[in-house]
Amino acid sequence: FSPLRRISIKILVHSLFSMLIMCTILTNCIFMTMNNPPDWTKNVEYTFTGIYTFESLVKILARGFCVGEFTFLRDPWNWLDFVVIVFAYLTEFVNLGNVSALRTFRVLRALKTISVIPGLKTIVGALIQSVKKLSDVMILTVFCLSVFALIGLQLFMGNLKHKCFRNSLENNETLESIMNTLESEEDFRKYFYYLEGSKDALLCGFSTDSGQCPEGYTCVKIGRNPDYGYTSFDTFSWAFLALFRLMTQDYWENLYQQTLRAAGKTYMIFFVVVIFLGSFYLINLILAVVAMAYEEQNQ
Protein backbone atom coordinates (compact mmCIF):
# COMPACT_ATOMS: atom_id res chain seq x y z
CA PHE A 1 0.00 0.00 0.00
CA SER A 2 1.22 3.49 -0.78
CA PRO A 3 1.61 5.95 2.14
CA LEU A 4 -1.30 7.99 0.80
CA ARG A 5 -3.56 4.96 0.83
CA ARG A 6 -2.42 3.98 4.34
CA ILE A 7 -3.27 7.48 5.63
CA SER A 8 -6.66 7.33 3.87
CA ILE A 9 -7.50 3.98 5.49
CA LYS A 10 -6.48 5.33 8.92
CA ILE A 11 -8.70 8.38 8.46
CA LEU A 12 -11.61 6.28 7.13
CA VAL A 13 -11.70 3.85 10.06
CA HIS A 14 -11.23 6.56 12.70
CA SER A 15 -14.34 7.27 14.80
CA LEU A 16 -13.70 11.03 14.71
CA PHE A 17 -13.99 10.99 10.93
CA SER A 18 -17.49 9.43 11.15
CA MET A 19 -18.34 11.95 13.86
CA LEU A 20 -17.18 14.86 11.67
CA ILE A 21 -19.27 13.67 8.70
CA MET A 22 -22.35 13.14 10.89
CA CYS A 23 -22.04 16.63 12.40
CA THR A 24 -21.52 18.10 8.91
CA ILE A 25 -24.67 16.42 7.57
CA LEU A 26 -26.79 17.53 10.55
CA THR A 27 -25.45 21.11 10.36
CA ASN A 28 -26.09 21.09 6.61
CA CYS A 29 -29.69 19.99 7.25
CA ILE A 30 -30.16 22.87 9.71
CA PHE A 31 -28.86 25.34 7.11
CA MET A 32 -31.21 23.88 4.49
CA THR A 33 -34.22 24.67 6.66
CA MET A 34 -33.47 28.42 6.52
CA ASN A 35 -36.12 30.46 4.71
CA ASN A 36 -34.03 33.47 3.76
CA PRO A 37 -30.42 32.47 4.38
CA PRO A 38 -27.93 35.34 4.76
CA ASP A 39 -25.14 35.80 2.22
CA TRP A 40 -22.44 34.24 4.43
CA THR A 41 -24.22 30.86 4.22
CA LYS A 42 -22.89 30.60 0.65
CA ASN A 43 -19.38 30.13 2.07
CA VAL A 44 -20.73 27.56 4.52
CA GLU A 45 -22.23 25.69 1.53
CA TYR A 46 -18.80 25.57 -0.10
CA THR A 47 -17.36 24.23 3.16
CA PHE A 48 -19.94 21.44 3.28
CA THR A 49 -19.24 20.55 -0.35
CA GLY A 50 -15.51 20.54 0.47
CA ILE A 51 -16.01 18.17 3.42
CA TYR A 52 -18.17 15.83 1.33
CA THR A 53 -15.57 15.88 -1.45
CA PHE A 54 -12.83 15.16 1.08
CA GLU A 55 -14.87 12.24 2.50
CA SER A 56 -15.36 10.75 -0.96
CA LEU A 57 -11.69 11.23 -1.88
CA VAL A 58 -10.63 9.46 1.32
CA LYS A 59 -12.98 6.57 0.53
CA ILE A 60 -11.77 6.37 -3.09
CA LEU A 61 -8.10 6.44 -2.05
CA ALA A 62 -8.66 3.83 0.66
CA ARG A 63 -10.87 1.44 -1.28
CA GLY A 64 -10.29 2.26 -4.95
CA PHE A 65 -12.85 3.81 -7.32
CA CYS A 66 -14.72 1.06 -9.16
CA VAL A 67 -12.43 -1.82 -10.20
CA GLY A 68 -12.52 -4.58 -7.61
CA GLU A 69 -15.08 -6.04 -5.22
CA PHE A 70 -15.03 -3.60 -2.29
CA THR A 71 -14.35 -0.38 -4.17
CA PHE A 72 -16.13 2.96 -3.73
CA LEU A 73 -18.81 2.58 -6.41
CA ARG A 74 -19.56 -1.06 -5.55
CA ASP A 75 -21.32 0.11 -2.37
CA PRO A 76 -24.81 1.49 -3.16
CA TRP A 77 -24.57 3.91 -0.22
CA ASN A 78 -21.63 5.59 -1.93
CA TRP A 79 -23.73 6.18 -5.05
CA LEU A 80 -25.73 8.62 -2.94
CA ASP A 81 -22.54 10.43 -1.82
CA PHE A 82 -21.35 10.58 -5.41
CA VAL A 83 -24.67 12.02 -6.67
CA VAL A 84 -24.68 14.62 -3.87
CA ILE A 85 -21.18 15.83 -4.82
CA VAL A 86 -21.89 15.83 -8.58
CA PHE A 87 -25.04 17.93 -8.08
CA ALA A 88 -23.23 20.26 -5.68
CA TYR A 89 -20.65 21.11 -8.36
CA LEU A 90 -23.24 21.17 -11.16
CA THR A 91 -25.47 23.72 -9.45
CA GLU A 92 -22.50 25.84 -8.44
CA PHE A 93 -20.28 25.99 -11.49
CA VAL A 94 -22.42 25.01 -14.51
CA ASN A 95 -25.08 27.37 -15.86
CA LEU A 96 -28.02 25.06 -16.55
CA GLY A 97 -30.83 27.60 -16.81
CA ASN A 98 -33.45 26.27 -14.40
CA VAL A 99 -31.08 25.73 -11.48
CA SER A 100 -33.87 25.76 -8.87
CA ALA A 101 -34.99 22.33 -10.09
CA LEU A 102 -31.47 20.98 -9.61
CA ARG A 103 -31.20 22.63 -6.19
CA THR A 104 -33.91 20.23 -5.08
CA PHE A 105 -31.31 17.47 -5.16
CA ARG A 106 -29.53 19.17 -2.25
CA VAL A 107 -32.16 17.50 -0.07
CA LEU A 108 -30.42 14.19 -0.85
CA ARG A 109 -27.69 15.32 1.55
CA ALA A 110 -30.07 14.58 4.40
CA LEU A 111 -30.18 10.95 3.23
CA LYS A 112 -26.44 10.69 3.85
CA THR A 113 -27.38 10.41 7.52
CA ILE A 114 -28.61 6.86 6.82
CA SER A 115 -25.22 5.67 5.65
CA VAL A 116 -23.47 7.22 8.66
CA ILE A 117 -25.77 6.00 11.48
CA PRO A 118 -25.40 2.19 11.73
CA GLY A 119 -28.82 1.47 13.27
CA LEU A 120 -30.57 3.48 10.61
CA LYS A 121 -28.61 1.64 7.92
CA THR A 122 -29.91 -1.69 9.26
CA ILE A 123 -33.52 -0.50 9.30
CA VAL A 124 -33.33 0.85 5.75
CA GLY A 125 -31.68 -2.40 4.69
CA ALA A 126 -34.61 -4.29 6.19
CA LEU A 127 -37.02 -1.98 4.41
CA ILE A 128 -35.35 -2.67 1.05
CA GLN A 129 -35.43 -6.42 1.76
CA SER A 130 -39.13 -6.21 2.63
CA VAL A 131 -39.83 -4.41 -0.67
CA LYS A 132 -38.13 -7.28 -2.51
CA LYS A 133 -40.27 -9.78 -0.64
CA LEU A 134 -43.38 -7.68 -1.29
CA SER A 135 -43.19 -8.17 -5.06
CA ASP A 136 -45.44 -11.26 -4.97
CA VAL A 137 -47.97 -9.62 -2.67
CA MET A 138 -47.92 -6.50 -4.83
CA ILE A 139 -48.64 -8.59 -7.93
CA LEU A 140 -51.57 -10.23 -6.10
CA THR A 141 -52.84 -6.84 -4.91
CA VAL A 142 -52.66 -5.26 -8.38
CA PHE A 143 -54.35 -8.34 -9.84
CA CYS A 144 -57.20 -8.21 -7.29
CA LEU A 145 -57.61 -4.45 -7.76
CA SER A 146 -57.66 -4.91 -11.54
CA VAL A 147 -60.34 -7.61 -11.36
CA PHE A 148 -62.55 -5.52 -9.11
CA ALA A 149 -61.85 -2.40 -11.19
CA LEU A 150 -63.15 -4.26 -14.25
CA ILE A 151 -66.25 -5.38 -12.32
CA GLY A 152 -66.77 -1.78 -11.13
CA LEU A 153 -66.32 -0.56 -14.69
CA GLN A 154 -69.10 -2.87 -15.90
CA LEU A 155 -71.44 -2.10 -13.02
CA PHE A 156 -71.02 1.63 -12.55
CA MET A 157 -69.65 3.10 -15.81
CA GLY A 158 -71.25 6.51 -16.30
CA ASN A 159 -73.50 6.19 -13.26
CA LEU A 160 -71.85 9.00 -11.30
CA LYS A 161 -72.85 11.48 -14.03
CA HIS A 162 -76.51 11.12 -13.04
CA LYS A 163 -77.86 14.40 -11.72
CA CYS A 164 -81.14 15.88 -10.60
CA PHE A 165 -82.16 18.35 -13.31
CA ARG A 166 -84.80 21.07 -13.03
CA ASN A 167 -88.04 20.31 -14.88
CA SER A 168 -89.15 23.80 -15.87
CA LEU A 169 -87.12 24.42 -19.02
CA GLU A 170 -87.75 27.58 -20.99
CA ASN A 171 -89.50 27.20 -24.33
CA ASN A 172 -86.47 26.88 -26.57
CA GLU A 173 -83.99 25.51 -24.05
CA THR A 174 -82.56 22.06 -24.55
CA LEU A 175 -80.20 20.09 -22.36
CA GLU A 176 -77.44 20.72 -24.90
CA SER A 177 -78.05 24.47 -25.13
CA ILE A 178 -78.08 24.71 -21.34
CA MET A 179 -74.89 22.70 -20.92
CA ASN A 180 -73.17 24.91 -23.51
CA THR A 181 -74.06 28.09 -21.65
CA LEU A 182 -73.27 26.90 -18.12
CA GLU A 183 -70.02 28.43 -16.92
CA SER A 184 -70.02 29.31 -13.25
CA GLU A 185 -71.18 27.18 -10.35
CA GLU A 186 -74.05 29.61 -9.92
CA ASP A 187 -75.29 28.71 -13.42
CA PHE A 188 -75.20 25.03 -12.53
CA ARG A 189 -77.15 25.64 -9.33
CA LYS A 190 -79.94 27.21 -11.41
CA TYR A 191 -80.59 23.97 -13.29
CA PHE A 192 -79.34 21.15 -11.03
CA TYR A 193 -80.36 20.27 -7.51
CA TYR A 194 -77.66 20.82 -4.88
CA LEU A 195 -77.85 19.80 -1.24
CA GLU A 196 -76.89 22.57 1.16
CA GLY A 197 -73.12 22.87 1.44
CA SER A 198 -72.52 20.39 -1.38
CA LYS A 199 -70.07 21.10 -4.21
CA ASP A 200 -71.70 18.60 -6.58
CA ALA A 201 -75.22 18.24 -7.92
CA LEU A 202 -77.38 15.66 -6.15
CA LEU A 203 -76.78 12.20 -7.58
CA CYS A 204 -79.70 10.03 -8.60
CA GLY A 205 -80.41 6.77 -10.40
CA PHE A 206 -82.92 5.05 -12.62
CA SER A 207 -83.38 1.85 -10.62
CA THR A 208 -86.05 1.60 -7.95
CA ASP A 209 -83.59 1.33 -5.05
CA SER A 210 -81.31 4.15 -6.21
CA GLY A 211 -81.53 7.78 -5.09
CA GLN A 212 -84.57 9.69 -6.30
CA CYS A 213 -84.80 13.37 -7.18
CA PRO A 214 -86.89 15.83 -5.19
CA GLU A 215 -90.14 17.19 -6.62
CA GLY A 216 -89.64 19.42 -9.64
CA TYR A 217 -86.46 17.62 -10.71
CA THR A 218 -85.78 14.67 -12.94
CA CYS A 219 -82.75 12.40 -13.23
CA VAL A 220 -80.53 12.93 -16.26
CA LYS A 221 -77.08 11.70 -17.20
CA ILE A 222 -75.06 14.74 -18.20
CA GLY A 223 -72.06 16.86 -17.26
CA ARG A 224 -69.00 15.77 -15.37
CA ASN A 225 -68.39 13.31 -12.57
CA PRO A 226 -68.33 14.33 -8.88
CA ASP A 227 -65.27 15.76 -7.11
CA TYR A 228 -64.13 17.84 -10.10
CA GLY A 229 -64.40 14.76 -12.34
CA TYR A 230 -61.95 12.66 -10.32
CA THR A 231 -64.49 10.21 -8.88
CA SER A 232 -65.81 7.79 -11.48
CA PHE A 233 -65.81 4.29 -12.89
CA ASP A 234 -65.85 5.53 -16.50
CA THR A 235 -62.48 4.11 -17.54
CA PHE A 236 -60.33 1.29 -16.21
CA SER A 237 -57.79 3.75 -14.75
CA TRP A 238 -60.43 5.78 -12.87
CA ALA A 239 -62.06 2.55 -11.66
CA PHE A 240 -58.66 1.29 -10.50
CA LEU A 241 -58.10 4.54 -8.59
CA ALA A 242 -61.54 4.20 -6.97
CA LEU A 243 -60.70 0.62 -5.93
CA PHE A 244 -57.34 1.74 -4.55
CA ARG A 245 -59.24 4.33 -2.55
CA LEU A 246 -61.48 1.60 -1.15
CA MET A 247 -58.49 -0.59 -0.30
CA THR A 248 -56.73 2.21 1.57
CA GLN A 249 -60.06 3.38 3.04
CA ASP A 250 -59.36 6.93 1.90
CA TYR A 251 -62.73 8.68 2.47
CA TRP A 252 -64.22 5.50 1.01
CA GLU A 253 -67.61 6.02 2.63
CA ASN A 254 -68.23 9.01 0.36
CA LEU A 255 -67.49 6.95 -2.76
CA TYR A 256 -69.73 4.20 -1.33
CA GLN A 257 -72.63 6.61 -0.74
CA GLN A 258 -72.24 8.28 -4.15
CA THR A 259 -72.20 4.96 -6.00
CA LEU A 260 -75.11 3.48 -4.05
CA ARG A 261 -77.18 6.59 -4.65
CA ALA A 262 -76.48 6.46 -8.41
CA ALA A 263 -76.63 2.68 -8.94
CA GLY A 264 -78.81 1.26 -6.19
CA LYS A 265 -78.49 -0.16 -2.69
CA THR A 266 -78.06 -3.73 -3.99
CA TYR A 267 -74.51 -2.89 -5.00
CA MET A 268 -73.45 -2.60 -1.38
CA ILE A 269 -72.48 -6.30 -1.79
CA PHE A 270 -69.70 -5.19 -4.15
CA PHE A 271 -68.34 -2.78 -1.55
CA VAL A 272 -68.57 -5.32 1.28
CA VAL A 273 -66.52 -7.83 -0.77
CA VAL A 274 -63.93 -5.18 -1.77
CA ILE A 275 -63.52 -3.86 1.77
CA PHE A 276 -63.18 -7.35 3.24
CA LEU A 277 -60.80 -8.66 0.62
CA GLY A 278 -58.90 -5.49 -0.27
CA SER A 279 -58.85 -3.51 2.91
CA PHE A 280 -58.83 -6.20 5.59
CA TYR A 281 -57.05 -9.10 3.92
CA LEU A 282 -54.58 -7.63 1.41
CA ILE A 283 -53.44 -4.73 3.59
CA ASN A 284 -52.77 -7.11 6.49
CA LEU A 285 -50.99 -9.50 4.15
CA ILE A 286 -48.66 -6.65 3.13
CA LEU A 287 -48.04 -5.81 6.80
CA ALA A 288 -47.33 -9.48 7.56
CA VAL A 289 -44.70 -9.66 4.80
CA VAL A 290 -43.03 -6.45 6.05
CA ALA A 291 -43.01 -7.81 9.62
CA MET A 292 -41.46 -11.08 8.42
CA ALA A 293 -38.77 -9.21 6.50
CA TYR A 294 -37.84 -7.16 9.59
CA GLU A 295 -37.75 -10.33 11.68
CA GLU A 296 -35.40 -12.01 9.19
CA GLN A 297 -33.15 -8.92 9.08
CA ASN A 298 -32.94 -8.82 12.88
CA GLN A 299 -31.94 -12.48 13.03
Epitope: M157, N167, T218, V220, K221
Partner: nanobody, 120 residues
Framework: EVQLVESGGGVVQPGGSLRLSCAAS????????MAWYRQAPGKQRELVAY??????ISYADSVKGRFTISRDGSKRVYLQMNSLRPEDTALYYC???????????????WGQGTLVTVSS
Protein backbone atom coordinates in the same frame (compact mmCIF):
# COMPACT_ATOMS: atom_id res chain seq x y z
CA GLU B 1 -80.81 5.99 -34.10
CA VAL B 2 -83.60 7.10 -31.73
CA GLN B 3 -86.60 8.81 -33.31
CA LEU B 4 -89.72 10.36 -31.88
CA VAL B 5 -92.80 9.75 -34.02
CA GLU B 6 -95.93 11.84 -33.48
CA SER B 7 -99.40 10.98 -34.71
CA GLY B 8 -103.02 12.01 -34.19
CA GLY B 9 -102.98 15.49 -35.71
CA GLY B 10 -105.67 16.73 -38.08
CA VAL B 11 -108.46 19.22 -38.68
CA VAL B 12 -111.07 19.65 -35.96
CA GLN B 13 -113.91 22.09 -35.25
CA PRO B 14 -113.78 24.51 -32.29
CA GLY B 15 -114.87 22.74 -29.11
CA GLY B 16 -113.77 19.41 -30.52
CA SER B 17 -111.18 16.94 -29.24
CA LEU B 18 -108.01 15.30 -30.50
CA ARG B 19 -105.57 12.83 -29.01
CA LEU B 20 -101.93 13.17 -30.01
CA SER B 21 -99.52 10.36 -29.40
CA CYS B 22 -95.73 10.23 -29.46
CA ALA B 23 -93.61 7.11 -29.40
CA ALA B 24 -89.86 6.66 -29.16
CA SER B 25 -88.51 4.18 -31.66
CA UNK B 26 -85.09 2.60 -31.71
CA UNK B 27 -82.85 1.63 -28.79
CA UNK B 28 -83.81 3.50 -25.63
CA UNK B 29 -82.17 2.86 -22.28
CA UNK B 30 -84.01 5.48 -20.31
CA UNK B 31 -86.51 8.27 -21.02
CA UNK B 32 -86.49 11.05 -18.46
CA UNK B 33 -88.93 13.75 -19.41
CA MET B 34 -91.43 13.81 -22.24
CA ALA B 35 -93.12 17.02 -23.31
CA TRP B 36 -95.37 18.55 -25.94
CA TYR B 37 -94.49 21.86 -27.57
CA ARG B 38 -96.32 23.81 -30.21
CA GLN B 39 -95.46 26.44 -32.77
CA ALA B 40 -98.22 28.54 -34.30
CA PRO B 41 -97.50 30.19 -37.68
CA GLY B 42 -95.29 33.26 -37.21
CA LYS B 43 -94.87 32.60 -33.50
CA GLN B 44 -92.19 31.14 -31.25
CA ARG B 45 -92.29 27.55 -30.13
CA GLU B 46 -93.90 27.22 -26.69
CA LEU B 47 -94.18 24.50 -24.05
CA VAL B 48 -97.64 22.96 -23.79
CA ALA B 49 -97.12 20.29 -21.12
CA TYR B 50 -94.59 17.85 -19.76
CA UNK B 51 -94.52 14.67 -17.71
CA UNK B 52 -91.58 13.18 -15.79
CA UNK B 53 -90.93 9.54 -14.81
CA UNK B 54 -91.82 10.38 -11.21
CA UNK B 55 -95.22 11.69 -12.32
CA UNK B 56 -94.54 15.44 -12.17
CA ILE B 57 -96.89 17.14 -14.64
CA SER B 58 -96.98 20.78 -15.70
CA TYR B 59 -99.16 22.69 -18.19
CA ALA B 60 -98.96 26.06 -19.89
CA ASP B 61 -101.53 28.50 -18.47
CA SER B 62 -103.33 28.71 -21.83
CA VAL B 63 -104.18 24.98 -21.87
CA LYS B 64 -104.80 24.25 -18.18
CA GLY B 65 -108.07 22.39 -17.66
CA ARG B 66 -108.44 21.57 -21.35
CA PHE B 67 -105.39 19.47 -22.17
CA THR B 68 -104.21 16.32 -20.37
CA ILE B 69 -100.79 14.78 -20.75
CA SER B 70 -100.25 11.13 -19.88
CA ARG B 71 -97.54 8.55 -20.19
CA ASP B 72 -98.05 4.93 -21.07
CA GLY B 73 -95.06 2.85 -20.03
CA SER B 74 -91.70 4.43 -20.67
CA LYS B 75 -91.67 4.96 -24.42
CA ARG B 76 -94.98 6.65 -25.20
CA VAL B 77 -96.68 9.92 -24.27
CA TYR B 78 -100.17 11.24 -25.12
CA LEU B 79 -101.79 14.64 -25.22
CA GLN B 80 -105.54 14.63 -24.87
CA MET B 81 -106.86 17.94 -26.20
CA ASN B 82 -110.44 18.92 -25.35
CA SER B 83 -112.42 22.13 -25.95
CA LEU B 84 -110.11 23.12 -28.78
CA ARG B 85 -109.99 26.75 -29.88
CA PRO B 86 -108.79 28.37 -33.13
CA GLU B 87 -105.73 29.73 -31.27
CA ASP B 88 -104.68 26.13 -30.61
CA THR B 89 -103.89 25.76 -34.30
CA ALA B 90 -100.19 24.92 -34.52
CA LEU B 91 -97.59 22.36 -35.35
CA TYR B 92 -97.32 20.14 -32.23
CA TYR B 93 -93.90 18.71 -31.44
CA CYS B 94 -92.99 15.93 -29.06
CA UNK B 95 -89.74 16.29 -27.13
CA UNK B 96 -87.96 13.84 -24.87
CA UNK B 97 -84.88 13.89 -22.70
CA UNK B 98 -83.54 10.39 -23.18
CA UNK B 99 -80.52 8.14 -22.95
CA UNK B 100 -80.15 5.83 -25.99
CA UNK B 101 -77.98 3.38 -24.01
CA UNK B 102 -76.45 3.22 -20.55
CA UNK B 103 -73.08 4.56 -21.76
CA UNK B 104 -74.47 7.64 -23.52
CA UNK B 105 -75.37 10.96 -21.96
CA UNK B 106 -78.95 12.16 -21.75
CA UNK B 107 -79.83 14.19 -24.86
CA UNK B 108 -82.75 16.20 -26.18
CA UNK B 109 -84.71 14.56 -28.99
CA TRP B 110 -87.46 16.21 -31.05
CA GLY B 111 -90.18 14.72 -33.22
CA GLN B 112 -90.88 16.03 -36.72
CA GLY B 113 -94.21 17.53 -35.61
CA THR B 114 -97.89 16.88 -36.28
CA LEU B 115 -100.25 19.60 -37.50
CA VAL B 116 -103.41 20.46 -35.57
CA THR B 117 -105.87 22.81 -37.27
CA VAL B 118 -108.89 24.15 -35.41
CA SER B 119 -111.39 25.84 -37.75
CA SER B 120 -115.05 25.89 -38.49
Amino acid sequence: EVQLVESGGGVVQPGGSLRLSCAASGPVFNINRMAWYRQAPGKQRELVAYVTPTGDISYADSVKGRFTISRDGSKRVYLQMNSLRPEDTALYYCRALLQPDRYSNTRTYWGQGTLVTVSS
